[in-house]
Amino acid sequence: ASVGLPSVSLDLPRLSIQKDILTIKANTTLQITCRGQRDLDWLWPNNQSGSEQRVEVTECSDGLFCKTLTIPKVIGNDTGAYKCFYRETDLASVIYVYVQDYRSPFIASVSDQHGVVYITENKNKTVVIPCLGSISNLNVSLCARYPEKRFVPDGNRISWDSKKGFTIPSYMISYAGMVFCEAKINDESYQSIMYIVVVVGYRIYDVVLSPSHGIELSVGEKLVLNCTARTELNVGIDFNWEYPSSKHQHKKLVNRDLKTQSGSEMKKFLSTLTIDGITRSDQGLYTCAASSGLMTKKNSTFVRVHEKPFVAFGSGMESLVEATVGERVRIPAKYLGYPPPEIKWYKNGIPLESNHTIKAGHVLTIMEVSERDTGNYTVILTNPISKEKQSHVVSLVVYVPPQIGEKSLISPVDSYQYGTTQTLTCTVYAIPPPHHIHWYWQLEEECANEPSHAVSVTNPYPCEEWRSVEDFQGGNKIEVNKNQFALIEGKNKTVSTLVIQAANVSALYKCEAVNKVGRGERVISFHVTRGPEITLQPDMQPTEQESVSLWCTADRSTFENLTWYKLGPQPLPIHVGELPTPVCKNLDTLWKLNATMFSNSTNDILIMELKNASLQDQGDYVCLAQDRKTKKRHCVVRQLTVLERVAPTITGNLENQTTSIGESIEVSCTASGNPPPQIMWFKDNETLVEDSGIVLKDGNRNLTIRRVRKEDEGLYTCQACSVLGCAKVEAFFIIEGAQEKTNLEHHHHHH
């Protein structure tokens, strides 16, 4: 047989025995001659170094580049590959020689009393026990012990090959301490040398330190660090630690194997480092190394040692937090301290407790911030050992994107009479106040709610061509007043007004307010009519159970068929900012009302009377008139508000008081209610009559008693009455001091 690649024009060495395999008997002589084209050498089994005394390699007598290998009295151990090769090349010819020695069928390694077989427990792996044979066709089995087990070739994963040895899946013999091969020849058993079975595992999956990070202690405390190595099975582990003062007196190291679940393919080892009475010099990096021999893994953690317990705020602690309404706000308590402090949060001095809207812990979390959350938050850190306290104030400012108050009025806006001057208003609430409020406009017919226009929440208006009010060409002449600031419902609001100097064309107006956190807008439908005009009789908002008339007046020569309607409820929900359908184009939502027609010289007047108005009568009333020539419908809308009846209530500063003679008393009694109540004053249950010293002003709201005299002393009552009843408040006025001599006794008696 030949091995290697032929190099330039060099033939392989030629052996005198032209066979791949040669079988000879023990005690005979083996002689092979090798001829070639340059210097040759021989290699033979068991002694590749050429120092074997029994083997003789001689130059041939009949030529150059020829060597003969001779072994007299061969033994079983001479079985193997004999190789003739050119020096310094791979070109070689090989013959495998079996020396049949039935007394020693297995080839023994020269120096070995026993061999070693390394295996892993992997189910897929096979191991070869190198019991080579001096006879090619032996019946060989493998014996393993203890307990004793015999494995016989099965033509599959268990086999024996004279040149290779016995092949078997490694897990089958992983239990065994030793194995050997056995051959049966003529009922006689022959054994190979013993092979010690070493189950090899080396892989370390990971090394984990516990605690893994953030280890803090103060001087004198005990440090306990656990280092766990997870490995494959059959692994032994060496642990080692590296730390700042490795020659520590009070150090203790304990290594042990941890129990793992049966069937687990993993083993756990634990090394515990304990230092009693830690010192500042022990601060630093602690590293644990685990090593199996073939693999080393390390992990580290930093141990911080403090001189004594302490607490302080970290440099990153905020003093101002800004948020927008609806956001989640997180204010972390950034601290340095050992041990970790107790943390308590306060708002304006009141302790905060966690609930579904707020979580007060290491981080103060407000789930959905609202305006009322604005304020000063104090976090107090307390060291649990030293009881040292540190406090820090965080101001939370909650911003509000612009909200336009009138936006809630979704119903159709009143129609406006042609040629009149009108004022449109946007009342904006925003924090911080809007840095600008801009007005825009567009002709009504360019922005009708046609079905072809898709209205979405993100783009609620089909109107796209908004123009600045500065450019009022083709529209109404406009003037924007300077923004006003007003306290409305306890909130500072910005009021922007737009004055339409003459209502000539129907249009839509939009006010847009912007601040640092958002924008808000309101669209106002400004429908101009030359048609009928609606007036209210009496000209004020009615209260429940009062009567009111709505008059619709139209020029008789221009209009006919005057009719009153009430606008039914709009289909809900209406998208924020969605424009109502022009009333005249959608008569389906109108309810026809009974009314009475009157006429004068030029006009028809259709009067719709509401007797005993109720809250249900509130709403939008539509007067519809038809142009006599064009038959085009004109409609006017008026929103009617019916005020709820409210029994009288009194507010004001009526309190018992003591006054000196000659001074003045001023008290007020503010009453509210609907209908507005009448106010009356009584002294000692008698109606108080005005005279030079007693003055009642502002519908009896304010009472002034000038230059009080002793007889002004008494019980004063303010009573507010309406059809719904009366409310009253009382106060006793004491008058002190001396008057004229004649009254001295009386005065003394009073005291």
């Epitope: 892989r203 090593s291 199996s292 893994k297």
Partner: antibody, heavy 117, light 112 residues
């Protein structure tokens, strides 16, 4: 700076013995597994032996099993390879290598062993 | 044992070009932890081997990003982009999936 310096290489007769040393510096020797790797004259690299950080666990290539012994002296930052029953095929340049995660991340410059009669 | 096969010589390459060096294993080096345990070393002339790549594709500390490793369970490639003079030497691959750890015979990087 990590340094590994091998010494002890020599010319030895077949069957003879020799002890190689590797002096380590620039790192905590006792926290790393150590290995010997040899490079044969035909430039092939062959892993020879490995030892765990504390010296309790040793591994050998089949070709040197029973003949070579790897050991370490952590106090002196030194790794050893005792080689007995030397054969001509042991002729090689012997490197000591530092091991972490199974990887040989630093190697020495090597020391040469020649086995010849 | 796992056999690692490498070509003796790479295709000669000109400075600035890219070169691929291949390595084949007789058995998959993909371990059950999902990692592929194959390393690449470079031995420059007159120097000891230096770890370039571990776990098939992770560059060792201080190794230029011109070196990149890739492969499957048994076939692996070391790619060197923009070859420089200092890249000359013998490149070895090594398997760490099964004991004993074995090296390839090495591939010599040839420059035109």
């Amino acid at each position: 700076e990590v340094q590994l310096v091998e010494s002890g290489g020599d010319l030895v007769k077949p069957g003879g013995s020799l002890k190689l040393s590797c002096a380590a510096s620039g790192f905590t020797f006792s926290m790393y597994g150590m290995s010997w790797v040899r490079q044969t004259p035909d430039k092939r690299l062959e892993w020879v032996a490995s030892i765990s950080i504390g010296g309790s666990y040793t591994y050998y290539a089949d070709s040197v099993e029973g003949r070579f012994i790897i050991s370490r002296e952590n106090a002196k930052n030194t790794l050893f390879l005792q080689m007995n029953s030397l054969k001509s095929e042991d002729t090689a340049l012997y490197y000591c290598a530092r091991e972490l995660d199974g990887n040989y991340d630093y190697w020495g410059q090597g020391t040469t062993l020649t086995v010849s009669s | 044992h796992i056999m690692i096969t490498q070509d003796e010589l790479s295709n000669p390459v000109t400075f600035g070009e890219s070169v691929s060096i291949s390595c084949r294993s007789s058995k998959s080096l993909l371990y059950k932890d999902g990692k592929t345990y194959l390393n690449w070393f470079l031995q420059r002339p007159g120097q000891s081997p230096q770890l370039l790549i571990y776990l098939m594709s992770t560059r060792a500390s201080g190794v230029s990003d011109r070196f990149s490793g890739s492969g499957s369970g048994t076939d692996f490639t070391l790619e060197i982009s923009r070859v420089k003079a200092e890249d000359v030497g013998i490149y070895y691959c090594q398997q760490l999936v099964e004991y004993p750890f074995t090296f390839g015979s090495g591939t010599k990087l040839e420059i035109k």
